[in-house]
Amino acid sequence: CRTSECCFQDPPYSDADSGSASGPRDLSCYRISSAGYECSWQYEGPTAGVSHFLRCCLSSGRCCYFATGSATRLQFSDQAGVSVLHTVTLWVESWARNRTEKSPEVTLQLYKSVKYKPPLGDIKVSKLAGQLRMEWETPDNQVGAEVQFRHRTPSSSWKLGDCGPQDDDTESCLCPLEMNVAQEFQLRRRRLGSQGSSWSKWSSPVCVPPENPPQPQVRFSVEQLGRDGRRRLTLKEQPTQLELPEGCQGPAPGVEVTYQLQLHMLSCPCKAKATRTLPLEKMPYLSGAAYNVAVISSNRFGPGPNQTWHIPADTHTEPVALNISVGTNGTTMYWPARAQSTTYCIEWQPVGQEGSLATCNLTAPQDPDPAGMATYSWSRESGAMGQEKCYHITIFASAHPKKLTLWSTVLSTYHFGGNASAAGTPHHVSVKNHSLDSVSVDWAPSLLSTCPGVLKEYVVRCRDEDSNQVSEHPVQPTETQVTLSDLRAGVAYTVQVRADTAWLRGAWSQPQRFSIKVQVSD
């Protein structure tokens, strides 16, 4: 027999199948050109000394063989004696060490058996009613296919599934979607309605994330406010990355979990924009304001659960940066200006009412005045900070007020509102004899002392009513007692106390009269 033809004789070996586990398998035969055909198969087991024979039986019952030696692939033409227009049955017999091993048979019409391609190019992945839907363009001239998929997770081996018959320019498949683990999918195709025809190769891996992106397990820390009025937000723990199946390791588009940082600036509610989402890789610098920060995990199916943290306001206060002058027309604040064309947000809130919404005002963009100061004024009628109580004032600045991450803290301080001069006057001034020539003066703390940094000092004034001589004694803001010495017995004195702020001289308390009794010696 000629090597290019199928030999219609008995093969040169005994016919018995040894039935061993090794041997030829996965035979597939298909047309590769208008008149050319190919059969290929796998051989399991030691290959030394193995000879392969491709067997073919025609519908008439006549059988022939091709001897391929050690090769597991054979090409032949439609002139090789094998009928290509009618159904034939093919199998492989492999002869080695005086025994024959036989593959499963395939029965097909060779002319119609076209080698199908797997899904090529872009396989679109979407979610449909809790299942995974894959869709792709049908390869050219290959409409009408059976499609299978196989899938695995990081901890499981391949499982086979069926996509059903396809008969359109686009093909699709519904597959199981895992809730919490990533999956790798591959697809293969064969001609519809020809069970004996061979499957295509498996497609490239399609990597699919779990339906639920993982809950981000992270912790934040925030640094001290810098001189520029901003503090760095840092991640103490990175989010854990998803475990991936073998074929999805390395750059596998589609399976990525991305983490976003959602900032919500709670302070300064009158600003243009309160929230901003940004990549977790670009951890922002924040002003000293209070924030809520959420980490949102997302994959190709959308966002997953998030975790939210509260970042409290920076409570560090500036002792003297703010100057407040109260005039007949109203009140003006002055503070060291930032760059030109800066927008300021002035926020105030009565101390002790931190839960309630702060009042705030946004200035128009302003340049520094000749003294390098920025200002904000309001009239008495507006009622702003009009009550006689302690207010916490924070001033924020931004050259881009719509950009949440560019706000910075200019200062944070306290201010006593209303008529601080009168409201701050110390009450309950009392005088007690201390020694033969001294007294102890006590008073109740000024209301100003409830306002951190506002009370600069107390001043105690003592007037000798005989000579009208006056002495004044400064007292630390933390003290509410002073000893007056070098007093003369029998002389009437009046004592008064006032409380001063950095920018305001307080009103004197009601005069308190006293005298030291003359000591009569026995």
Epitope: G226, R232, Q260, P279, Y285, L406, S408
Partner: antibody, heavy 117, light 110 residues
């Protein structure tokens, strides 16, 4: 006026080094994140590197990782790009750009780097 | 090969409207803000659109941006000869930890 001015470009042999500078004016440089972006002749924009306002976070494109180093000096209002082991494919116009929340709102006019033997 | 995909060129007559598409993935456009840049011949790029659809001051309202899923679109109405330029989309890619641009689209006003 807000302005960025690049300098330091020139002709260099393959394997050589160059240091690009970008001088910022008209804004508070220390508050802003910055980027370098390049454009090869007749080609599109290619992002090169990012540095945040206080130099605590830095990123590079894979094409320059290990060869280029971004840095800044806020006291001098300056951004830098140290380029080592230069290759023919690094020939481009190099721009520095100010970033505000993921968009580059101010660009310099660029400085030309030519790598050729 | 650019991470973001844009058509190489578009053209239209003066007064007409054009759109330029930019497609990416969930790790870039899908989860981050998109910007658009205009580069007139021989000049540096200029920010045209930020945060998907916001215009910087000085940019006419003939320019608009939108985003849907993993794609973004730049729209230009009332085309003028002065709009002839290269247009680039750009964003951050969270998987690459890198900035990314589209390959650019040359707009020709016929």
């Amino acid at each position: 006026e807000v302005q960025l001015v690049e300098s330091g470009g020139g002709l260099v042999q393959p394997g050589g080094s160059l240091r690009l500078s970008c001088a910022a004016s008209g804004f508070t440089f220390s508050s802003y994140d910055m980027n370098w972006v390049r454009q090869a002749p007749g080609k599109g924009l290619e992002w090169i590197s990012y540095i945040n306002s206080r130099s605590s976070t830095i990123y590079y494109a894979d094409s320059v990782k290990g060869r280029f180093t971004i840095s800044r000096d806020n006291a001098k209002n300056s951004l830098y790009l140290q380029m080592n082991s230069l290759r023919d494919e690094d020939t481009a116009l190099y721009y520095c750009a100010r970033e505000i929340e993921d968009s580059m709102d101010v660009w310099g006019q660029g400085t030309t780097v030519t790598v050729s033997s | 090969q650019s991470v973001l995909t844009q058509p190489p060129s578009v053209s239209a007559a003066p007064g007409q409207k054009v759109t330029i598409s930019c497609s990416g993935s969930s790790s870039n456009i899908g989860n981050n803000y998109v910007s658009w840049y205009q580069q007139l011949p021989g000049t540096a790029p200029k920010l045209l659109i930020y945060d998907n659809n916001e215009r910087p001051s000085g940019i006419p309202d003939r320019f608009s941006g939108s985003k849907s899923g993993t794609s973004a679109t730049l729209g230009i109405t009332g085309l003028q000869p002065g709009d002839e330029a290269d247009y680039y989309c750009g964003t951050w890619d969270s998987s690459l930890s890198a900035g990314v641009f589209g390959g650019g689209t040359k707009l020709t006003v016929l």
